[in-house]
Amino acid sequence: ACDTATCVTHRLAGLLSRSGGVVKNNFVPTNVGSKAF
């Protein structure tokens, strides 16, 4: 899987969208690596 910063940002945005934004406050692109997915 793509693990560049931009890929991580887009994947996280998709995850947030699917979860209705109900995730931990520190679950942001600069805090999570690709392995978080």
């Epitope: 793509c2 560049t4 931009t6 996280l12 945005a13 942001v28 600069t30 805090n31």
Partner: antibody, heavy 119, light 107 residues
Framework: QVQLVQSGAEVVKPGASVKVSCKAS????????MNWVKQAPGQGLEWIGD????????HYNQKFKGRVTLTVDTSISTAYMELSRLRSDDTAVYYC????????????WGQGTLVTVSS | DIQLTQSPSFLSTSVGDRVTITCKAS??????VAWYRQKPGKSPKALIY???YRYSGVPSRFSGSGSGTEFTLTISSLQPEDFATYIC?????????FGQGTKLEIK
């Protein structure tokens, strides 16, 4: 609203250094990566690198590695790009850009900073 | 580095026309391609991410498709503000790379 405001145009001599700033507002600066992109006159876009404002981590395009340094000052939500040993082919507009998710999911770019290398 | 080749480089067209721009990658980049519109003297404006998703506020006349090595941007009905340069970018691998651009000119 999200804004990236860059420092003004610079005229610098060959061999010198330049430091361009990019002040972010309207979002949490430390949450999103900041990219830097070069556009020489009449030319295409060239990615320089990115910086993680949360920990200062960087990725650099090998073409610029050794001459470029990307840093941040989180206390003033500002990213910096310093380019050293300037040559005439460094004359370009330099952009900062960041993809945010909150408050809006979008890819924002600064207005650009023209750096002219001339003796 | 991944090379992105756009075609055509120039396109002379008219308001209301349907336009398709192609971006070919030298290696498989999955769906990890973005498209930008740039007007002279202005910053690039993001249109599409992940090959086919429009950013918020981007008009529905813009659509993207493709995966792997071949991508397209389609503008279904050109508006006066669409005469500009369109640029693809891959972000699947470092360093990120851009296509050389496709300039749309008024016929």
């Amino acid at each position: 609203q999200v804004q990236l405001v860059q420092s003004g145009a610079e005229v610098v001599k060959p061999g010198a250094s330049v430091k361009v700033s990019c002040k972010a507002s309207g979002y949490t600066f430390t949450d999103y990566y900041m990219n830097w992109v070069k556009q020489a006159p009449g030319q295409g876009l060239e990615w320089i690198g990115d910086v993680n404002p949360n920990n200062g981590g960087t990725h650099y395009n090998q073409k610029f590695k050794g001459r470029v340094t990307l840093t941040v000052d989180t206390s003033i939500s500002t990213a910096y790009m310093e380019l050293s040993r300037l040559r005439s082919d460094d004359t370009a507009v330099y952009y900062c850009a960041s993809i945010t998710i909150v408050p809006v999911y979008f890819d924002f770019w600064g207005q650009g900073t023209l750096v002219t290398v001339s003796s | 580095d991944i090379q992105l080749t756009q075609s055509p480089s120039f396109l002379s067209t008219s308001v209301g026309d349907r336009v398709t721009i192609t971006c070919k990658a030298s290696q498989n980049v999955g769906p990890n391609v973005a498209w930008y519109r740039q007007k002279p003297g202005k910053s690039p404006k993001a249109l599409i991410y992940s090959a086919s998703y429009r950013y918020s506020g981007v008009p529905s006349r813009f659509s993207g498709s493709g995966s792997g090595t071949e991508f397209t941007l389609t503008i279904s009905s050109l508006q006066p503000e669409d005469f500009a340069t369109y640029i693809c970018q891959q972000y699947n691998y470092y360093p990120y790379t851009f296509g050389q651009g496709t300039k749309l000119e008024i016929k």
